[in-house]
Interface confidence: low
């Protein structure tokens, strides 16, 4: 059979080369002389020439030693052709598997590995993992299977077997109790990796195990009592820095302090954070303090570490007395945001509302008012009473200043304290609609055919709100109803414009009057382009080229030629003779009734 089983060839073969591997043989060689060839990477494509075949015998040859670590498998194709070059067999798969030799030793991925473990941990605690790799095969052979071991440990305190290494994973673990950072802060292990699962070549590296500090000292406040003065109303104000000492390793989790307010802050006015460099507790205001409500706060602050205590330790507490200093406070509008309904278009001088502020201070201070932001300039405010009046025309439909029927104004109140303070309020005027806009059709330009015209549907928009909108009514004015009809649909929100008499191709003004539910009327001129066409149209087509009939093709061509000649002559005549005054558009259009065939030539 024209089949070859996979061929296994060891890497680094000594030869002699070329070395015979296997013979390709086609049973078609009884009928004709067969020539054999091979193709594929390793034969005729890179790396070329590793394999060859004896053309006439079919012996597959290896020309040089193989390196499994470069290429582990070659996939070639065997071919058999007759003397005339005709293929006598389908290409045959030839798989050459390169088998491994132990020609690489293990290599640690680092010269020095670093790991750490807490002092006092129990035996069995994992410290770190080291890795060595071997380029040889570890699946079908032991050549690339690495076994790990510890060769030596320095120092040998409290004894020389403090650690063990898992022979296959390289995980280093604690094997004995007694790790004490204060006595031995670091161990150096010489580790080995040996291939052939421990029976082959060996390589070494160093594993440094750092013994980490356990939290066996509590932080202590120095001093334990603090007193501070803070102005009222200030948020984020630094009240006090609290200092602690800790005997554990500086900048470690066992040394870094964590502060908590454990008493005296029922109103949740304060917060305490740890300063990243000094390890101090920074006490700040989370909310503004109110002198009028409480002029002194006594806080109790507790300190622990980022790491939990390793042994039972007492927790230190400090006392902070906070005195609140009185300051002049800004007036506060009541409410801070006021919603008022007012009809649009009210007369100038008409009152809108009264908007006043209260002063939180205990003294009776005088408050004066003014408008801070009035984008359209529609309002004025009495400085003493806070009375807001209209000085311009409030327009609900003004899209530049009004959003969702609301006009937003910002007002200011100022007290007469020393120094004076100000507060702001927001006035939201909800503008009530009046029927001050008539309905408008959209679009205001249409294009329509003068034969079998499609009805033009125009949308009706009215800037006012219901009930000052639909249903709408439509009426044609200025004799537009002679040629056109206008009807409002059942829903009353669109108007349908139809051509009822034939008009020649031209542009016409259609006078359309629309009125809303409140009888507010609006006259709009629609620009109608009438085209010589049937049915639907976007833009007017070119001039007509003959009758409606479908005559013979010869007659059609002659007709076109005649039309073109007439058009050229007509063009010259038009240039020479001055044009006659055109008749009124509608008069001229009335000559032919709608539905007739329009045969005028529009040169």
């Amino acid at each position: 059979d024209w089949v070859v089983a996979p061929i296994s060839v060891p890497e680094n073969g000594k030869g002699p080369f070329p070395q015979r591997l296997n013979q390709l043989k086609s049973n078609k060689d009884r009928d004709t002389k067969i020539f054999y060839s091979i193709t594929g990477p390793g034969a005729d494509s890179p790396p070329e020439g590793v394999f060859a075949v004896e053309k006439e015998t079919g012996w597959l040859l290896l020309n040089k030693p193989l390196d499994r670590e470069e290429i582990a498998k070659y996939e070639l194709f065997g071919h058999a052709v007759s003397e005339n070059g005709a293929s006598v067999e389908d290409p045959m798969n030839i798989s050459i598997i390169v088998t491994d030799q132990n020609d690489h030793k293990p290599k640690f991925t680092q010269d020095t590995f670093r790991g750490s473990v807490l002092e006092g941990v129990l035996p069995g605690t994992s410290v770190m993992q080291v890795t060595a790799t071997d380029e040889d095969d570890a699946i079908y052979t032991y050549n690339g299977v690495v076994a790990y071991s510890i060769h030596s440990q320095e120092p040998k305190d409290p004894h020389d077997l403090m650690f063990t290494i898992h022979r296959s994973t390289g995980t280093i673990s604690v094997i004995s109790s007694g790790l004490d950072r204060e006595k031995v802060p670091e161990y150096t292990l010489t580790i080995q990796a040996t291939d052939m699962d421990g029976d082959g070549s060996t390589t070494t590296a160093v594993a440094v195990v750092e013994i980490l500090d356990a939290n066996d000292n509590a932080p202590m406040f120095e001093p334990q009592k603090y007193e501070a003065w803070v102005p009222e109303n200030e948020v984020g104000h630094e009240v006090q820095r609290l200092t602690v000492t800790d005997l554990d390793v500086p900048n470690s989790p066992a040394w870094r302090a964590t502060y908590h307010i454990v008493g005296g802050d029922d109103g949740d006015h304060f917060t305490i954070t740890t300063h990243p460099e000094t390890n101090q507790g920074v006490l700040t205001t989370k909310k503004g303090l109110d002198f009028e409500a409480q002029d002194q706060h006594t806080l109790y602050v507790e300190v622990t570490n980022e790491a939990p205590f390793a042994v039972k330790l007492p927790t230190a507490t400090a006392t902070v007395v906070v005195h609140v200093k009185d300051v002049n406070e800004a007036p506060v509008f009541v409410p801070p945001s006021k919603v008022v309904e007012v009809q649009e278009g009210i007369p100038t001088g008409e009152p809108v509302c009264v908007y006043t502020a209260e002063d939180p201070d205990k003294e009776n201070q005088k408050i004066s008012y003014r408008i801070l932001r009035d984008p359209a300039g529609w309002l004025a405010m009495d400085p003493d009473s806070g009375q807001v009046t209209a000085v311009g025309t409030l327009d609900r439909e003004d899209e530049q200043f009004v959003r969702n029927n609301i006009y937003e104004v910002m007002v200011l109140a100022m007290d007469n304290g020393s120094p004076p303070t100000t507060g702001t309020g927001t006035l939201l005027l909800t503008l009530i609609d009046v029927n001050d806009h008539g309905p408008v059709p959209e679009p205001r330009q249409i294009t329509i055919c003068n034969q079998s015209p499609v009805r033009q549907v125009l949308n009706i928009t009215d800037k006012d709100l219901s009930p000052h909108t639909s249903p709408f009514q439509a009426q044609l004015t200025d004799d537009s109803d002679i040629y056109w009809t206008a009807e409002v649909n059942e829903e009353g929100d669109t108007v349908v414009l139809s051509l009822k008499k034939f008009l020649k191709q031209d542009t016409y003004d259609v006078h359309l009057s629309l009125s809303d539910h409140g009888n507010k009327e609006q006259l709009t001129v629609i620009r109608a382009t009438v085209c010589d066409c049937h049915g639907h149209v976007e833009t007017c087509p070119g001039p007509w080229k003959g009758g409606s009939g479908g005559g013979g093709s010869g007659a059609g061509v002659i007709a076109v030629i005649v039309v073109v000649v007439i058009a050229i002559v007509a063009g010259i005549v038009v240039l020479v003779i001055s044009r006659k005054k055109r008749m009124a558009k509608y008069e001229k259009a009335e000559i032919k009734e709608m539905g007739e065939m329009h045969r005028e030539l529009n040169a």
């Epitope: 990477p41 470069e70 030793k105 290599k107 680092q110 010269d111 380029e135 390589t203």
Partner: antibody, heavy 121, light 107 residues
């Protein structure tokens, strides 16, 4: 910070040899391959070969066998390349470049600044 | 020997544009292809290895893709510092061949 520092420019006569160096710092020199790459003026990059300083294992591009010899000194974290029997074709900038692992997984991530070798009589 | 065809040989683009450079190989190298940028008078800088892994410190506007014999490097929103020569490199089989390079110039 990983650094690969190369020796200065060399002007050598045809037929002579030159040895250029590459000093590494900031990483495990012994367990990373050091590659050497050639670049002729205005041309592309050509891989010469690589050395594993841990045990001196080398791999060469066939084109440079007999031309380049790669060595390494672990104690000084320095890799060397000697170019012999120089001709004008050897005039180029030679870069050394670290390869983080000795398998196929990694490319050359830290490069020296290059050493210019000019062969002229 | 493994053949590498890098295209285009040169490319002109403006800051903010997106460009793509391709690298075609004569045989399968799986995903083991790297991309480097070399500015005039400087050493090459590793951008991408293993076809699509960004090297440390390389901005995310660079992205590599492909496997087998067809690879590409895409640079989104070109910055002034992105101009220079770009090389692809096989880091699978010996010898570690480089592409002929693509010169990316400012338009």
């Amino acid at each position: 910070v990983q650094l690969v520092e190369q020796s200065g420019a060399e002007l050598v006569k045809p037929g002579a040899s030159v040895k250029i160096s590459c000093k590494a710092s900031g990483y495990a020199f012994s367990s990373s391959w050091m590659n050497w790459v050639k670049q002729r003026p205005g041309k592309g990059l050509e891989w010469i070969g690589r050395i594993y300083p841990g045990d001196g294992e080398t791999k060469y591009n066939g084109k440079f066998k007999g031309k380049a010899t790669l060595t390494a000194d672990k104690s000084s974290s320095t890799a060397y390349m000697q170019l012999s029997t120089l001709t004008s074709e050897d005039s180029a900038v030679y870069f050394c470049a670290r390869q983080r692992d000795y398998g196929a997984l990694y490319a050359m991530d830290y490069w020296g600044q290059g050493t210019s070798v000019t062969v002229s009589s | 020997e493994l053949q590498m065809t890098q295209s285009p040989a040169s490319l002109s683009a403006s800051v903010g544009e997106t460009v793509t450079i391709t690298c075609r190989l004569s045989e399968n190298i799986y995903s083991y292809l790297a991309w480097y940028r070399q500015k005039e008078g400087e050493s090459p800088q590793l951008l991408v290895y293993n076809s699509k892994t960004l090297a440390e410190g390389v901005p995310s506007r660079f992205s590599g893709s492909g496997s087998g014999t067809q690879f590409s490097l895409k640079i989104n929103s070109l910055q002034p510092e992105d101009f220079g020569n770009y090389y692809c490199q096989n880091h699978y089989g010996f010898p570690f061949t480089f592409g002929a390079g693509t010169k990316l110039e400012i338009k």
